[in-house]
Amino acid sequence: PSGLVTANITDSEALARWQPAIATVDSYVISYTGEKVPEITRTVSGNTVEYALTDLEPATEYTLRIFAEKGPQKSSTITAKFTTDLDSPRDLTATEVQSETALLTWRPPRASVTGYLLVYESVDGTVKEVIVGPDTTSYSLADLSPSTHYTAKIQALNGPLRSNMIQTIFTTIGLLYPFPKDCSQAMLNGDTTSGLYTIYLNGDKAEALEVFCDMTSDGGGWIVFLRRKNGRENFYQNWKAYAAGFGDRREEFWLGLDNLNKITAQGQYELRVDLRDHGETAFAVYDKFSVGDAKTRYKLKVEGYSGTAGDSMAYHNGRSFSTFDKDTDSAITNCALSYKGAFWYRNCHRVNLMGRYGDNNHSQGVNWFHWKGHEHSIQFAEMKLRPSNFRNLEGRRKRA
């Protein structure tokens, strides 16, 4: 025979074709072998011109041989080489599908691989590709869009060889709150890491506000609106600054009275204060917390104490906010001026969390009277808020 070729090569099959011998022959003897694959020999009829090779190993170079037989005579042997395709990974599945994440899992191909190419595409045409290592059989997709259909495909790689792609289709779940109005709604959307988030006041996408969410303290879901930790930020600021907010949300900052008013106007909120000093910790929770609008000079409502720090905020309940340039306290002197800070001063304070960092002079520092008195400036303080009914919302989400 002559002209031996292979066609229709896959990862496990190939078709051998040849030109018949000029003379009439009784049979053709076909043998094929690959690296680490034992030789297989088959005899076929003399009028056959093709033979399907099956059960081949993937990604393997085979040597194919054929000769003709007539009686005791044997023709010379002709040879061809071919390489089977790389077989595909199997059983690609999307599990743990959330609003912005999903887990892809697959079974490896039989052939050894040098890696995998993952491609995932949303219906809007956004395509992302990622290459993962040869020992990987799962990959977490992140930053997906909620309520979106995705097609995920995977292809095995071995040097220049690429397997066929297999695919799976999944749909991310819709966000419970597409425009979360606070950190509790962000958390109920599945975000559980503390850090910067965008919230939308009253759920209005035009009213975006970047906030720091504490997702760990007492179940999480807290908007942090004050942090003192190192004294790098100046808190002896004027009325305008306290109304608008200042500082770095990741470091020391004040979120702003206008923002506090808008947030607490959205519903019933609770306040949590976390204090830390030389390894000691204390906290205070108030189950009713609100800040009035500018017309009330941001009047404070804080009621329903529980905790370990002592009820120091009660003294400030019902008070308007004071800064050195807008004195609204009930003292003859200007409390903000006297104590170099700003707060809902009365005459003057049990709490001075916006006082002078590290100043242990009487009433001048970062004070929470019923924990450390007025002659000790506390090293770390955070004030934060979340809806009073957060526990109920959280329970509902878990049941859902």
């Epitope: 309940n317 003292a331 009487h362 009433s363």
Partner: antibody, heavy 120, light 107 residues
């Protein structure tokens, strides 16, 4: 109107016990801290004990610590002072006083007082 | 404990006089100071809280001032019903303590 009425005073021998009561009306009782303040005959005012609105926190003057116990029953709008191991120096007019809203250490309403005389 | 010292212990004045009573705390108390009036056989009555805030219903002839350790109660024009004993009280820390009292009587 807001009113506090004390009762339970009387003559008692040293070492004995007495329980004072204070009935409150005209305000949301459990929103406010409550206190006992006493005044020995012809003398000034001395704070004795205080209790938070919920009853969860109690405070005492050193002179009565370990002998007196303050308590409240918010369902009955009532404040109590259990006085044990009474001494002659506990003789005084005992006033029940309401703490001011916000921080309860300013006394904005007072009862008329109940007299406790400790004598053998 | 914080000691509160009032002066004078007593004073005699006439109707229409301006009367000033001082109170000194043994340690810094910001503005955590209250003034009470007590008439014979009656319970004390809150006049001034937070050093300078007039309690509801108290006549405006009464005023308070001061912060830190030194405080003053002033009656701008003494009236017949003002003859009584006046006490200062610190509400800064427990135990809340009173001054020894200032008795204002008719000259």
């Amino acid at each position: 109107q807001v009113q506090l009425v004390e009762s339970g005073g009387g003559l008692v021998q040293p070492g004995r016990s007495l329980r004072l009561s204070c009935a409150a009306s005209g305000f949301t009782f459990d929103d406010y801290a409550m206190h006992w303040v006493r005044q020995a005959p012809g003398k000034g005012l001395e704070w004795v004990s205080g209790i938070s609105g919920s009853g969860g926190s109690t405070y005492y003057a050193d002179s009565v610590k370990g002998r007196f116990t303050i308590s409240r029953d918010n369902a009955k709008n009532s404040l109590y002072l259990q006085m044990n191991s009474l001494r002659a120096e506990d003789t005084a007019l005992y006033y029940c006083a309401k703490g001011q809203k916000g921080e309860g250490d300013t006394f904005d309403i007072w009862g008329q007082g109940t007299m406790v005389t400790v004598s053998s | 404990d914080i000691q509160m010292t009032q002066s004078p212990s007593s004073l005699s004045a006439s109707v229409g006089d301006r009367v000033t009573i001082t109170c000194r705390a043994s340690q810094y108390i910001q503005g955590f100071l209250n003034w009470y009036q007590q008439k014979p056989g009656k319970a004390p009555k809150l006049l001034i809280y937070d050093a300078s805030n007039l309690e509801t219903g108290v006549p405006s002839r009464f005023s308070g001032s001061g912060s830190g350790t030194d405080f003053t109660l002033t009656i701008s024009s003494l009236q017949p019903e003002d003859f009584a004993t006046y006490y200062c009280q610190q509400s800064y820390s427990t135990p809340q303590t009173f001054g020894q009292g200032t008795k204002v009587d008719i000259k």
